[in-house]
Amino acid sequence: PPRGRILGGREAEAHARPYMASVQLNGAHLCGGVLVAEQWVLSAAHCLEDAADGKVQVLLGAHSLSQPEPSKRLYDVLRAVPHPDSQPDTIDHDLLLLQLSEKATLGPAVRPLPWQRVDRDVAPGTLCDVAGWGIVNHAGRRPDSLQHVLLPVLDRATCNRRTHHDGAITERLMCAESNRRDSCKGDSGGPLVCGGVLEGVVTSGSRVCGNRKKPGIYTRVASYAAWIDSVLA
């Protein structure tokens, strides 16, 4: 099943997020992703946990998953590089870099997103955009078109409360509020964008969605700048 959902959001403006990628397994949407360089997509390591025998591809330039669009193109994956410290049973280091079989053809609907290199927390309350093709309600309806939602960043102390994530949120993670509007599992690997810059990647750990006491968890890309640079080099 696809990992992820946008709850309480709305349909995104078509092709207004040209960095948005759909990581696909055997032709079906699995996870979100974000184009960070001409030939590289950043996603979540857990997305490929169950993909050992399947064909992994990356869809760029899409708004609708099913309808033909001039900008849409499906790329094979030359190399998948999960973060070396990612593990199945933790949310830590949940990053994955996918090298496309060739450089993406760039244009208005396909463009890499600048990512944050300065290792400093986003101020609590900052509104950030998260997008994805995950299910849109608790009944499990899957959208065909890209959805998005604006979420306020939550301070780490609140996110670390026992009734929230009880100390699991390290300095390399950040949280966003989850009161009915939320990202969740299948949006895993998708981008959290603050002020036009990639700040976080949706983690793919299992959690309740849309419950304000269980905020969304995002991997802070700035904390992994050295690793990203070393893989892209």
Epitope: P124, D155, R156, A157, T158, N160, R161, R162, T163, D166, G167, I169, E171, V208, N211, K213, K214
Partner: antibody, heavy 116, light 112 residues
């Protein structure tokens, strides 16, 4: 290694105030709420309140409203609790404890004795 | 406030015995997020309390597997399969689901 170092014992007169401190080290101070707990001699534990070091926001047990004031100094990674209008009933050991991984980390306690 | 009632208040044991401590809350401590924030702490004389069990049955890191927690709703139990000398002290149950968070009165585990 997470450590919470509390200030030393206090002997204070009835009606006076006292301010005790809890200096945090081994983690980022603003990443966790700090809680305060009272333990009267030979008795159980009572939660006083908590504070978010990011913004100074506090939540207090109704029983300690007007008695305890919680503050933080982010620059020194220190939490403070001021107790005012002290009576013999305030004589106790006071603990700070970090929230996040439940209350896994506690200070060593500060003994406050109220006596004329 | 949620009242946490522990029984017994004193539990004399011999080393190697199994020990069982009960904790009952005055109302359900299932949080609105679905989790139950029932914890157990051990306090030895002159020391700060130490976390043993969180969310009813999860052992905190470094806690020996002779400690186990169980229960649901309002009734909870801490079991020590074979008591060792280092286990002696006062055990407190705690609920973190409702504000104000509250502790039980404590159970003193002591040698017979």
């Amino acid at each position: 290694e997470v450590q919470l170092q509390q200030s030393g014992p206090e002997l204070v007169k009835p009606g006076a105030s006292v301010k005790i401190s809890c200096k945090a080290s081994g983690y980022t101070f603003t990443d966790h709420y700090m809680n305060w707990v009272k333990q009267s001699h030979g008795k159980s534990l009572e939660w006083i309140g908590d504070i978010n070091p990011n913004n100074g926001g506090t939540s207090c047990n109704q029983k300690f409203k007007g008695k305890a004031t919680l503050t933080v100094d982010k620059s020194s990674s220190t939490a403070y609790m001021e107790l005012r209008s002290l009576t013999s009933g305030d004589s106790a050991v006071y603990y700070c404890t970090r929230e996040g991984a439940s209350f896994a980390f506690w200070g060593q306690g500060t003994l406050v004795t109220v006596s004329a | 406030d949620v009242l946490m009632t522990q029984t017994p208040l004193s539990l004399p044991v011999s080393l190697g015995d199994q020990a069982s401590i009960s904790c009952r809350s005055s109302q359900s401590i299932v949080h609105s997020n679905g989790d139950t924030y029932l914890e157990w702490y051990l306090q030895k004389p002159g020391q700060s309390p130490k976390l043993l069990i969180y969310k009813v049955s999860n052992r905190f890191s470094g806690v020996p597997d002779r400690f186990s927690g169980s229960g649901s709703g309002t009734d909870f139990t801490l079991k020590i399969s074979r008591v060792e000398a280092e286990d002696l002290g006062v055990y407190y149950c705690f609920q973190g689901s409702h504000v104000p968070v509250t502790f039980g009165a404590g159970t003193k585990l002591e040698l017979k």
